[in-house]
Interface confidence: medium
């Protein structure tokens, strides 16, 4: 043992323990020899605060008095300085400074499981920054009582490790916490319980949920519980949402009849428990259960469009194209598209399943009336069939909206207005809004996109599969009956300078004026729809400006004759391309001499 | 009962670092205080850091403050001392030791590193520094 006093001691009155703002006194006293050699009025006792001087004293004790002590530990060391050699410690003493324990507060005990044990909880109040013992007591029926002692810094919970048994629900238990230290002790206010008050039950466990005869309206969740549980509460919700259903049942006996659940939807389940109707509290819920409920046949109807293409003089190409049922139409896993193709006069019908794919292109005659009707099938059933008579969409041109335009509106959106037809307006039973990327080969495989719009709508907001920089082939039909007109236009959400001209490929000459081909500027690089191309050309060698020519764009044009250039002339020519946002850089450049005669 | 093991020493450059571990067990460990005190040969015992686990306050011997650092793992009952930059004079027996809360009140906000409150002590661990 290291004997850290053997030169002096260091007393304290009136304690080592003091209440927060008393004073203490400090003695620090050497033992005989143990002073400085030759003199000891020499000795000069220095008390140090931790590493801080605050008193000295020239011969054999110091006496101090301090006051101001912070709640906590404060060391006290005393040394001695003797002439010409370094401080030697003497003695030290620690001084805690702490308050009497507060009441305990808001004292509660509970049982976790009619086989658990009892444990309490309080509030300990303010740190006292001493020692402090926490008495848990419990007193029962027939005089008996449990004991527990706590000697945690920060004890605010005791197990008693006994079990109450429901044998008297009705009996009463009083517990009460006391808490001592060395300044004073303080005792929690009584608190009374049966067992039905602190039994709280474990979780439901075991839960599992079964459908009858594979249907989503014959459905049973069963569960496990502890055997004196009265009440359950389940919850459940999707699993994609965030709110829960709730139901509240009494003496279920482990299981409940649910008739609200949505097909093909993945559920999370929980249960909670309790043992009396007004007493004790609920169980934790359960750990969650998820399932899946079975499918049910398809609701709703699939919104079908279609596009018809000329091939030859008896025979024309039919696309149908369909969207997807929302979730909650489709009730389960669409596992194939019926399409039936009929022949109105003749009753000819064909049959079709398409899986994979939301369209399908046939060739039929161009001669009859032609009708479809698509449907979606689940396991359980089909959707109802969407019916459409195949017409000519656009043969009436009274029915043809006016004034169409297209106008980008934010980021990836057109906004596509129009005016109502010249025809009675009141006979338009929809409009559709059909918009496709445009491909200057009138690519078919290019996917579709519609929208359907009310009658007396004149415009529409166009935001699925929109792509910056792309042009788009906007149709607006108007469908009454049997009959229907369309207008279309061009239109893009953003645009900007096309990245490169138009590639002329041939100047060809016919009879005194030329005619220029060119290749089509690659999609991705037209940035927007083109208004107009530029032919420019001017004398080889010449620094005189270009004269130019401008056509307006059209989607097939790929070829345009000039006549005024001069025979024997050589001349460089080349192209340019614009969108609303500028010109494109200059294409190739070729070298043409016009070979006829001069006017 | 009351065991405090020391581990960690061994022989290091000037300027290298160690860390020293204390393990700790057979008393209520978050109410205690826990240091770390060195001898050197022929010195007395002296202070070097202190901690209180309940609390996490930390106390240091000035000729350490700023290289060496007091650190605890309340799950494994166990303190540290990361020495860093050490000297030749840092040269000594390293011993971990414990105040139980009983003998010395909470220890409070603040353990301190004076000898006689310290009940509890190990074995030691050997440090050697060497230019």
């Known amino acids: 043992k290291i004997d850290a006093c053997k030169r002096g001691d260091v007393t304290v009155k009136p304690s080592h323990v003091i209440l927060l703002g008393s004073t203490v006194n400090i003695t620090c006293s050497l033992k005989p020899r143990q002073g400085c050699f030759h003199y000891s009025r020499r000795n000069k006792l220095i008390l140090y605060k931790f590493d801080r001087r605050i008193n000295f004293h020239h011969g054999h004790s110091l006496n101090s008095q301090v006051t101001g002590l912070p709640l906590g530990t404060t060391l006290f060391v005393c040394k001695l300085a003797c002439i010409n050699s370094d401080e030697i410690q003497i003695c030290g003493a620690e001084i805690f400074v702490g308050v009497a324990p507060e009441q305990p507060q808001n004292l509660s005990c509970i049982q976790k499981g009619e086989q658990g044990t009892v444990a309490c909880t309080w509030e300990r109040g303010r740190d006292t920054h001493l020692y402090t013992e926490y008495t848990l007591q419990l007193s029962g029926p027939k005089n008996l009582t449990w004991q527990k002692q706590c000697k945690d810094i920060y004890c605010d919970y005791l197990d008693f490790g006994i079990n109450l048994t429901p044998e008297s629900p009705e009996s009463n238990f009083t517990a009460k916490v006391t808490a001592v230290n060395s300044l004073g002790s303080s005792s929690s206010l009584p608190s009374t319980f049966t067992f039905l008050d602190i039994v709280r039950p474990l979780p439901p466990w075991d839960i599992r949920i079964k459908f009858q005869k594979a249907s989503v309206s014959r459905c049973t969740l069963y569960w496990r519980d502890e055997g004196l549980v009265l009440l359950n509460r389940l919850r459940y919700r999707p699993s994609n949402s965030r709110l829960w259903n709730m139901v509240n049942v009494t003496k279920a006996k482990g299981r409940h009849d649910l008739l609200d659940l949505k097909p093909f939807t993945e559920y999370e389940f929980q249960i909670s428990s309790k043992l009396h109707l007004y007493k004790g509290s609920w169980s934790d819920w359960s750990e969650s259960l998820r399932a899946q409920t079975p499918e049910e046949e398809p609701t709703g109807m699939l919104d079908v469009w279609y596009m018809k293409r000329h091939i030859d003089y008896s025979r024309q190409q039919i696309s149908l194209f369909w969207k997807n049922l929302s979730v909650s139409e489709a009730r389960g896993k669409i596992l194939h598209y019926q399409v039936t193709l009929q022949e109105l006069t003749g009753g000819k019908a064909m049959t079709q399943n398409i899986t994979g794919h939301t369209s399908w292109t046939t060739v039929i005659p161009r001669t009859g009336n032609w009708a479809v009707a698509v449907s979606a099938a689940n396991s359980k059933g089909s959707s109802l069939p969407t019916r459409i008579n195949i017409m000519n969409l656009c043969e009436a041109g009274l029915l043809a909206p006016r004034q169409v335009s297209a106008n980008s509106e934010g980021m990836d959106n057109i906004l596509v207005t129009w005016q109502p037809p010249r025809k009675d307006p009141s006979a338009v039973q929809e409009y559709v809004v059909e918009w496709r990327e445009l491909h200057p080969g009138g690519d078919t495989q290019v996917p579709l996109n519609w929208l359907r719009s009310r009658p007396y709508n004149v415009s529409a907001l166009i935001s699925e599969n929109i792509k910056s920089y792309i042009c788009y082939e906007i149709r607006v039909y108007a469908l009454s009956g049997d009959q229907g007109g369309c207008s279309s236009i061009l239109g893009n959400s953003k645009h900007k300078a096309p990245l490169s001209g138009p590639h002329i490929n041939a100047i060809t000459e016919e009879k005194g004026s030329i005619l220029i081909s060119w290749n089509s500027i690659p999609v991705q690089e037209q940035m927007g729809c083109l208004l107009h191309y530029r032919i420019y050309w001017k004398e080889r060698d010449s620094n005189s400006q270009p004269q130019l020519c401008e056509i307006p764009y059209r989607v097939s044009q790929n070829s345009h004759p000039i006549n005024s250039l001069q025979p024997r002339v050589t001349y460089v020519l080349w192209m340019t391309a614009l969108t609303a946002a500028g010109e494109s850089s200059h294409g190739n450049e070729r070298e043409f001499c016009l070979q006829g005669k001069a006017n | 009962q009351v065991q405090l093991q020391e581990s960690g020493g061994g022989s290091v450059q000037v300027g290298g670092s160690l860390r020293l571990s204390c393990a700790a067990s057979?008393?209520?460990?978050?109410?205690?205080?826990l240091g770390w005190f060195r001898q050197a040969p022929g010195k007395e015992r002296e202070g070097v850091a202190t901690?209180?686990?309940?609390?996490?306050?930390?106390f240091y011997a000035d000729s350490v403050k700023g290289r060496f650092t007091i650190s605890q793992d309340n799950a494994k009952n166990t303190v540290y001392l990361q020495m860093d930059s050490l000297k030749p004079e840092d040269t000594a027996m390293y011993y971990c030791?414990?105040?139980?809360?009983?003998?010395w009140g909470s220890g409070g906000n603040r353990c301190s590193l004076w000898l006689p409150a310290y009940n509890y002590w190990g074995q030691g661990t050997q440090v050697t520094v060497s230019s």
């Open positions: 901690i209180y686990p309940a609390g996490g306050n930390i």
């Open positions: 030791a414990a105040r139980g809360g009983q003998t």
């Open positions: 057979g008393f209520t460990y978050s109410s205690s205080c």
